[in-house]
């Protein structure tokens, strides 16, 4: 659909005569009739197949025709057509004399014709005005013409319908050739598809309007490129939704079981070495001079009673010092200047001379010791507690404080690792020499049967239209991640596509 526009510019009829040569009285009051028709190999009389238009009287004899409107008529003249413009045409322009006010063909005498032109033309849509001039012996007509498309019609032949829109069915304007030009933020054949936020993950994100990034189930983050881990996952991550892959040192279904107490809590003090020995269990190996479960106790070097013969021990920064009683000397007061005559043996100890009376030895009654029977026996000296148990003096007796996993008077008994039911989800526990082993029931795995490897809900391929399936470990169900253009719990429904359009 388009318009053939004809601009009449100038008509010259200096002598003011008709085609017959007869003069007009008083002058030639001139109007025009225009006939536009299909291209003919030889221009021939016949119907004006592309349309006709007439002007009012535009002037007398010779005159220039003003642009826009002249005496109520339009200039350029408009000859609309509602078909594909063929590119060629035949044009007939007649100049007539109007003796009166009635310009109808039947009201005019046949000899009122002033002049007539008939041409064959070729004209592309949108071309600049084409100027032409037709001269006869008596008249001259200067005119120009062009073809433009009607609103919403485009292309070389005005045959492409395109109406700009910005609604559910499209967001575009029209290019000169009738192709769509999407508005910023839209794409697709009909510019219906929003361009999501730059970087929005192709599969895991989508949008309903430009520069948006909405995440599909199981994904999060500004660009929907971060998976959502299993609900309740504490110290774990995921690479696909609903996973809970434990960080180093953590275990269990939710990665909330501490398998690396040493690293996470640093329980050993004073530079002791920490060793993990099970869930929330550890052993501290103390540096010399320290003791206690966490090596938190500083050992006094005097605690081992190094001073003999009643010498008193004094702690010093770099060791200890023995203050010897009279008659004794040496680092540990081990040398005596006494003999049995000096009654050196305490607590009922009996003295025996040695080396011809130059020295002596005390034989101590039970519960006493020392070179002069001056010390009460420390029942912990022999380190009777096994398996790292701590020995405690309790008056005449002693007792052992055992480390976790050991029991008995001397901590000589290994408590069964299985006693505290360490195997999760009904796993069977087996005691081993250096720990335990869990035999897991179907659907679970891991050192303590803490990892759920439940029946894969995705195994039956429940998702349609090439959707991605994810298993929700907490419910043993699946979630379908739909590709663009599909919805539904199984992505089984296509998003309603718009009706087809003629362009």
């Amino acid at each position: 659909s388009g318009v053939f526009q004809l601009q009449l510019q100038e008509f010259i009829n200096e002598r003011g005569v008709l085609a017959s040569g007869r003069p007009c009285e008083p002058g030639c009051r001139t109007f025009f009739r225009v006939c536009l028709k299909h291209f003919q190999a030889v221009v021939s009389p016949g119907p004006c197949t592309f349309g006709t238009v007439s002007t009012p009287v535009l002037g007398t004899n010779s005159f220039a025709v003003r642009d826009d409107s002249s005496g109520g008529g339009r200039n350029p003249l408009q000859l609309p057509f509602n078909f594909t413009w063929p590119g060629t045409f035949s044009l007939i322009i007649e100049a007539w004399h109007a003796p009166g006010d009635d310009l109808r063909p039947e009201a005019l005498p046949p000899d009122a014709l002033i002049s007539k032109i008939a041409i064959q033309g070729s004209l592309a849509v949108g071309q600049n005005w084409l100027l032409d001039e037709q001269t006869s012996t008596l008249t001259r007509l200067r005119y120009s013409y062009r073809v433009i498309c009607s609103d919403n019609y485009y292309g070389d032949n005005c045959s492409r319908l395109c109406k700009k829109r910005n609604d559910h069915f499209g967001h575009y304007v029209c290019q000169p050739d009738g192709n769509l030009s999407c508005l910023p933020g839209w794409t697709g054949e009909y510019c219906q598809q929003p361009i999501c936020l730059s970087g929005c993950h192709e599969q895991n994100g989508y949008c309903s309007k430009p520069a948006e990034c909405l995440c599909r189930p199981g994904w999060q983050g500004r660009l929907c490129n971060e998976c959502i881990p299993h609900n309740g996952c504490r110290h774990g991550t995921c690479s696909t939704p609903w996973q809970c892959t434990c960080d180093e040192g953590w275990g269990g279904l939710f990665c909330d079981q501490d398998l690396n107490y040493c690293t996470h809590h640093s329980p050993c003090k004073n530079g002791a070495t920490c060793s993990n020995s099970g869930q929330r269990s550890y052993t501290c190996t103390c540096r010399p001079g320290y003791t206690g479960v966490d090596c938190e106790l500083e050992l006094s070097e005097c605690d081992s009673n190094p001073c003999r013969n009643g010498g008193s021990c004094k702690d010093q920064e770099d060791g200890y010092h023995c203050l010897c009683p009279p008659g004794y000397y040496g680092l540990h007061c081990e040398h005596s200047t006494l003999s049995c005559a000096d009654s050196p043996c305490f607590n009922g100890g009996s003295c025996r001379e040695r080396n011809q009376g130059a020295n002596y030895a005390c034989e101590c009654p039970p519960n006493f010791t020392g070179s002069n029977c001056e010390k009460k026996v420390d029942r912990c000296t022999s380190n009777p507690c096994a398996n790292g148990g701590q020995c405690l003096n309790r008056g005449p007796s002693r007792m052992c404080r055992c480390r976790p996993g050991f029991t008995g008077t001397y901590c000589e008994l290994h408590v069964s690792d299985c006693a505290r039911n360490p195997c999760a989800h009904g796993g069977t526990c087996h005691d081993l020499e250096n720990g335990l082993m869990c035999t897991c029931p179907a659907g679970f795995s891991g050192r303590r049967c803490e990892v759920r490897t439940s029946i894969d809900a995705c195994a039956s391929s429940p998702c349609f239209n090439r959707a991605t399936c994810y298993t929700d470990l907490s419910t043993d169900t699946f979630v379908c991640n739909c590709p663009y253009g599909f919805v539904g719990s199984r992505c089984e429904f296509p998003v309603g596509l718009p009706p087809s359009f003629p362009w």
């Epitope: 030889v42 016949g46 033309g121």
Partner: antibody, heavy 118, light 107 residues
Framework: EVQLVESGGGVVQPGRSLRLSCAAS????????MYWVRQAPGKGLEWVAF????????YYRDSVKGRFTISRDNSKNTLYLQMNSLRAEDTAVYYC???????????WGQGTMVTVSS | DIQMTQSPSSLSASVGDRVTITCRAS??????LAWYQKKPGKSPKLLIY???RLQDGVPSRFSGSGSGTDYTLTISSLQPEDFATYFC?????????FGQGTKLEIK
Amino acid sequence: EVQLVESGGGVVQPGRSLRLSCAASGFTFSNYGMYWVRQAPGKGLEWVAFISHGGGITYYRDSVKGRFTISRDNSKNTLYLQMNSLRAEDTAVYYCAALNWELGIDYWGQGTMVTVSS
Amino acid sequence: DIQMTQSPSSLSASVGDRVTITCRASEDIYSNLAWYQKKPGKSPKLLIYAANRLQDGVPSRFSGSGSGTDYTLTISSLQPEDFATYFCLQGSKFPLTFGQGTKLEIK
């Protein structure tokens, strides 16, 4: 008096060229589409080429397309037919004509003979 | 291309006879048809155009009729000067095509 006078015909060998001219007088040459028509000895009339009044449109019969060129010089009131790669079957009397039946115009020249022979 | 089939190819008639020549187009030519008279050594002469319009200066014994694909030239009363070859020409589309001609001879 309306006159169309063809010239340039003659005997030519196959493969050679000729240029026909048609001089117009007695009418407004620039107003009309012009035609070349030929008649081979003992045969009927055959249209050859067309050019519109301003020279913007040209048409040719298939057998001469690419070999013949129609042109016009409105300032000299002259129509031309450049004929290249001539063949024996191009032998004919060539007429120029101004045809516009809408205006009752039908002017023909007297014809010029073109003979293509070795 | 539009084919023009003219008949008869030759015709013998006497002065005063009424003669009819026909042309059939291979498709609708919308009355864009002319009839020409051609004598040896002479240029074609237009008799009828637009199927039925008599060219200025042509005797009224010549008439044309028809539409669509079928057209007729009638000479109501043959005169001695009418013995010639007659051609139809379609001016609807390029290539322009002529009928094969009808040679009108004296009986």
